[in-house]
């Protein structure tokens, strides 16, 4: 996941926010799956 060539603060910020959203979605799915399997 390189997200392009820009290294300015805004590009870095947008990438960081994307990672946070992605991880939240993945962890949320895993949590729901665990609850479902109980």
């Amino acid at each position: 996941h390189s997200d392009g060539i820009f290294t300015d603060s805004y590009s870095r910020y947008r990438k960081q926010m994307a990672v946070k959203k992605y991880l939240a979605a993945v962890l949320g799915k895993r949590y729901k799956q665990r609850v479902k399997n109980k």
């Epitope: 997200d3 300015d8 994307a18 990672v19």
Partner: antibody, heavy 110, light 111 residues
Framework: SVEESGGRLVTPGTPLTLTCTAS????????MGWVRQAPGKGLEWIGD?????TTDYASWVNGRFTISRTSTTVTLKMTSLTTEDTATYFC????????WGQGTLVTVSS | AAVLTQTPSPVSAAVGGTVTIKCQSS????????LAWYQQKPGQPPKLLIY???NLASGVPDRFSGSGSGTQFTLTISGVQCDDAATYYC???????????FGGGTEVVVK
Amino acid sequence: SVEESGGRLVTPGTPLTLTCTASGFSLSRYAMGWVRQAPGKGLEWIGDISTYGTTDYASWVNGRFTISRTSTTVTLKMTSLTTEDTATYFCARDYWLSLWGQGTLVTVSS
Amino acid sequence: AAVLTQTPSPVSAAVGGTVTIKCQSSQSVYDNNALAWYQQKPGQPPKLLIYAASNLASGVPDRFSGSGSGTQFTLTISGVQCDDAATYYCLGGYDDAADNAFGGGTEVVVK
């Protein structure tokens, strides 16, 4: 280069999906954004999608548009279209929109 | 959503002269510098000129320069050429991307 496709004449309320493809670089390595321009008007930022598939939209979108991606395409799905959505729709590379396609024209008319 | 207000059109410039276009945001952009400038000619897509307020995009002549911080930004074209006749847009990036928006555009006429 970047190329948009899928624009056509539709009636109000008809859903429409636009597609963005790339040549000369790997689309999967870049965040991609969508921008539109009504005839004779200015540019309007719609939203973008990260390499992780997470999305951000302009506040005015209100859930009517959805951006998604595969390894080779980025799509813009539009619903509840009105005549106000008549515009040329551009796909552009990365958060700074550094490389643009020629655009695809969407005309919404009854 | 943020509102970006640009210098009213048209702005007239003489070949070899200097043009200044201003962009004012209703709220501070991210890190006080998340602002870009684009050039668009009739029938063509926009072209990135400046990003992060003052960074020249790849392949853009250095007669284009950007400055400013927070809510006030400026695009300057020095040694204006006929080829610079176009409409110029600013784009602001914000803490919440839902606020991202373009300015209304400024047309530059070269005489």
